[in-house]
């Protein structure tokens, strides 16, 4: 194996901090898995830098990442998903920094979708439902979900509920009447696989009914 880098490039490179982080997404595109890495310092000069993964692969010893602006990624079926891989930042043949990582411990699920809230007048509650692509997956099937909701006027006052199913009931009496609420959900691996929270789903907005003065009940939306 042979690569090259100008001496000046290497000397400059050694002054930089090449800390990086990565996450994997399993069966993100059919049976294809993905691995995404990025430098923690957004100001690092990435011109001649490449990422390479070696070990715990099928068919090949090492794979080169593809660069897309500031991120580096691989999409392939060829992750063994057993044992640790060595991920290195390289300039030519020289490794600047490496991490040994088990790809099953850095899993970032796909964001939940189709979040919706339905008010049940008779039950005086709100049924929150959402979907996740992970129900159809072979590997990362078991997730913990974090549903977060807030009154729209309360900028940072989120209430969080953790659940393992994709359905949640919010009691009407726990919410303010005649108020606009924002709700969103994210997921994290919860069995065998470890990793990070997914991105948040798109937010859903709903309004609580007003209180009916005679009965003390809220009006439906």
């Amino acid at each position: 194996e042979s690569g090259y880098a100008q001496n000046g490039d290497l000397e400059d490179a050694e002054l930089d901090d090449y800390s990086f982080s990565c996450y994997s997404q399993l069966e993100v595109n059919g049976s294809q898995h993905s691995l995404t890495c990025a430098f923690e310092d957004p100001d690092v000069n990435i011109t001649n830098l490449e990422f390479e993964i070696c070990g715990a692969l099928v068919e090949v010893k090492c794979l080169n990442f593809r660069k897309l602006q500031e991120i580096y990624f691989i999409e392939t079926k060829k992750f063994l998903l057993i044992g640790k891989s060595n991920i290195c930042v390289k300039v030519g043949e020289k490794s600047l920094t490496c991490k040994k990582i088990d790809l099953t411990t850095i899993v970032k699920p796909e964001a939940p979708f189709d979040l919706s809230v339905v008010y049940r007048e008779g039950a005086n509650d709100f049924v929150v439902t959402f979907n996740t692509s992970h129900l159809q997956k072979k590997y990362v099937k078991v997730l913990m979900h974090d549903v977060a909701y807030r009154q729209e006027k309360d900028e940072n006052k989120w209430t969080h509920v953790n659940l393992s199913s994709t359905k949640l009931t919010l009691l009407q009496r726990k919410l303010q009447p005649a108020a606009m609420y924002e709700i969103k959900v994210r997921s994290i691996p919860d069995h065998y696989f470890k990793g990070f929270w997914s991105e948040w789903s798109p937010s859903y907005y709903f309004r609580t009914p007003e209180i009916n003065n005679s009965s003390g009940e809220m009006d439906p939306i």
Partner: antibody, heavy 122, light 107 residues
Amino acid sequence: AVQLVESGGGLVQPGGSLKLSCAVSGFTLSDYYMAWVRQAPKKGLEWVATISASGLRTYYPDSVKGRFTISRDDAKRSLFLQMTSLKSEDTATYYCARPMSAHYGFNYFDYWGQGVMVTVSS
Amino acid sequence: DIQMTQSPASLSASLGETVTIECRTSEDIYNGLAWYQQKPGKSPQLLVYSANSLHIGVPSRFSGSGSGTQYSLKINSLQFEDVASYFCQQYYDYPLAFGSGTKLEIK
């Protein structure tokens, strides 16, 4: 349709130099690793050089390391092989080859050029 | 470096017969193996990759199998157009390496 067309072959004396070119069409060159493979007359195939999709990394067998240099010009849709200090055992048909899979480095080749003959002889 | 041992060097078979070409590697290549067909005066053509995946357009009478260090290419119901040389290639690691080839002829 994908096409790879080699040029630049010919007769050269031992110790001499030659630069082969491969003009590509029908695909985005910058998405692919590219390689040169050679075949001596009536012999088997021998891998000669590979260059990564970014052009930042090159790979050679010991038999040509230090003598051959693979390079690419994606804007001109061309791959090159600069050969120096040529020996009689470098006599072969040289093929430009493209891996089937883009980007990452799965080096099995689904497209080959027609080949160009290099003869090293005094 | 990974060494490739391909056998037999030549093979003569009758039309309609089944033939098998073997390729052995000096270390486990985790299915990083391809097979090529080369007809006289032509460039090689990919037949099989990932040890057992048939390349698009290749007749189904060709099949690849194997794992670890032992791989094979089988041609069922031999046809006249199968007369060619066949090469295995490991792409698990650099340096990439080809087998020495098998020349297939019709009896």
